[in-house]
Interface confidence: low
């Protein structure tokens, strides 16, 4: 006869490990007992359990409550055992010794590999601001056994760098994602993807990018200067900008205080019926926590009578 086992048994931390040992004997052969021991090099053998055909299972005090027989039905030639709730310290080499009648003793070894799935953590970098150079967006760390793979899934352009720290029974991998912040990245997901043989599927942690910026300011409302004439109602200037965080707006007049009756409503400057005193240089000041911008325009309120007079002069001059 011969013993059937596995070279390597792989189990995830916390799961039960089945240590296989099956005697495939000739007709009429019987298994008297199976002894299991841990036989790591240089440490000698430590008995786990003895499985006796007559007296049943005996477990050593060091493994009390952790070693069991597989659930029935059981084949009397099967000496496999279950090691409950595998921990990292269980990783190593095991030996089963089978005593048979009449063929004698057989032994076989297997290696137990305990996978420690990583528990990844993602740490955002410093606040991202448009105009910065290459900046750390986030770092992702995962420790496991064996060393996990840490990659990034994103549509954002950037560069990655990884480093690994080996510990006695595991390895920690840290990957950093650097980018040049731009406003188009706002709200974009940056996902750390951790792969490991102990995971049924990749673990993913998503960080949403938040980039502070402030666009150049511009003023709308003066597209047709001819509309800015004495008596016109509903004239307004609107300051255009966008930013993150959302900006606030402030209106001033460069050549004096804002005329009475002019209403400031956030990004909009509303005028009462126009008079020549509304002519002047107006400044829109846009700011957020990140930056500030100015845009100025010159308002020239036309006097229609003056204009018609000029036209007459031109005609007469010709």
């Amino acid at each position: 006869g011969e013993l059937e086992t596995s070279d390597v048994v792989t189990v995830v931390l916390g799961q039960d490990a089945k240590l296989p040992c099956f005697y495939r004997g000739d007709s009429g052969e019987q298994v008297g007992q199976v002894a299991w021991a841990r036989v790591d090099a240089g440490e000698g053998a430590q008995e786990l359990a003895l499985l006796h055909s007559k007296y049943g299972l005996h477990v050593s005090p060091a493994y009390e409550g952790r070693v069991e027989q597989p659930p029935p039905p059981r084949n009397p030639l099967d000496g496999s055992v279950l090691l409950r709730n595998a921990v990292q310290a269980d990783e190593g080499e095991y030996e089963c010794r089978v005593s048979t009648f009449p063929a004698g003793s057989f032994q076989a070894r297997l290696r137990l590999r305990v996978l420690v799935p990583p528990l990844p953590s993602l740490n955002p970098g410093p606040a991202l601001e448009e105009g910065q150079g290459l900046t750390l967006a986030a770092s992702c760390t995962a420790e496991g056994s064996p060393a996990p793979s840490v990659t990034w899934d994103t549509e954002v352009k950037g560069t990655t760098s990884s480093r690994s720290f080996k510990h006695s029974r595991s390895a920690a991998v840290t990957s950093e994602f650097h980018l040049v912040p731009s406003r188009s990245m706002n709200g974009q997901p940056l996902t750390c993807v951790v792969s490991h043989p102990g995971l049924l599927q990749d673990q993913r942690i998503t960080h949403i990018l938040h980039v502070s910026f402030l666009a150049e300011a511009s003023v709308r409302g003066l597209e047709d200067q001819n509309l800015w004439h004495i008596g016109r109602e509903g004239a307004m200037l609107k300051c255009l900008s966008e930013g993150q965080p959302p900006p606030s707006y402030n209106w001033t007049r460069l050549d004096g205080p804002l005329p009475s009756g002019v209403r400031v409503d956030g990004d909009t400057l509303g005028f009462p019926p126009l008079t020549t005193e509304h002519s002047g240089i107006y400044v829109c000041h846009v700011s957020n926590e990140f930056s500030s911008r100015d845009s100025q325009v010159t308002v020239d309120v036309l006097d229609p009578q003056e204009d018609s007079g000029k036209q007459v002069d031109l005609v007469s001059a010709s």
């Epitope: 953590s121 993602l122 955002p124 606040a127 942690i205 998503t206 960080h207 949403i208 938040h210 502070s212």
Partner: antibody, heavy 121, light 107 residues
Framework: EVQLVQSGAEVKKPGSSVKVSCKAS????????MHWVRQAPGQGLEWMGW????????NYAQKFQGRVTMTRDTSISTAYMELRSLRSDDTAVYYC??????????????WGQGTLVTVSS | DIVMTQSPSSLSASVGDRVTITCRAS??????LNWYQQKPGKAPKLLIY???SLQSGVPSRFSGSGSGTDFTLTISSLQPEDFATYYC?????????FGQGTKVEIK
């Protein structure tokens, strides 16, 4: 033990502002994002935005941009949410909620007890 | 915005029943789906994150499954303390959005 303790109920007039506080204890305040979620009477949950207590960076839902401001005071481990230009449909229970360590961006593992804000003339 | 739709809006069940609540996203959200339980006058409580991961301290009778657009919350054997409103929530992208809720009532 992680705890988020919010300020008491408020009654406000339309057009006014309200500022709700959320004091954190039992963990490192700057290590977890803080979210704000509201719930109108008899209605579902609505996410308003988050603040990163470490940097002060915020992300607001578009619906509330321009009306909401989220701030924090790290010295007293407290987050604040101010909502301006209140309307009657802003009547709701406002919750602060901690983003979890693994999924700080969008999984809320601890919640405050809620603050009822009533907007009525 | 990603719209989350739960069904049913309400259901009546008895203690010991197996209860299933479904949640559908208007677009694929991979496994970025979380479930919360809320009792009247109380704050919501996290049950399941990442579609199927049980939050620490939550009884094992709660389980979650699904990926992409279709997700399920299952209570294997309903207990008296489980009568509440359940919400799904996506954490795939901002704005973070919730389902409208499913109220589980006593039959």
């Amino acid at each position: 033990e992680v705890q988020l303790v919010q300020s008491g109920a408020e009654v406000k007039k339309p057009g006014s502002s309200v500022k709700v506080s959320c004091k954190a204890s039992g963990y490192t305040f700057t290590g977890y994002y803080m979210h704000w979620v509201r719930q109108a009477p008899g209605q579902g949950l609505e996410w308003m935005g988050w603040i990163n207590p470490n940097s002060g960076g915020t992300n607001y839902a578009q619906k509330f941009q321009g009306r909401v401001t989220m701030t924090r005071d790290t010295s007293i481990s407290t987050a604040y949410m101010e909502l301006r230009s209140l309307r009657s449909d802003d009547t709701a229970v406002y919750y602060c909620a901690r983003g979890s360590a693994l999924h700080f961006f969008g999984v809320f593992d601890y919640w405050g007890q809620g603050t009822l804000v009533t907007v009525s003339s | 915005d990603i719209v989350m739709t739960q069904s049913p809006s309400s259901l009546s069940a008895s203690v010991g029943d197996r209860v299933t609540i479904t949640c559908r996203a208007s677009q694929s959200i991979s496994s970025y789906l979380n479930w919360y339980q809320q009792k009247p006058g109380k704050a919501p409580k996290l049950l399941i994150y990442a579609a199927s991961s049980l939050q620490s301290g939550v009884p094992s009778r709660f389980s979650g499954s699904g990926s992409g657009t279709d997700f399920t919350l299952t209570i294997s054997s309903l207990q008296p303390e489980d009568f509440a409103t359940y919400y799904c929530q996506q954490s795939y992208s901002t704005p973070l959005t919730f389902g409208q809720g499913t109220k589980v009532e006593i039959k």
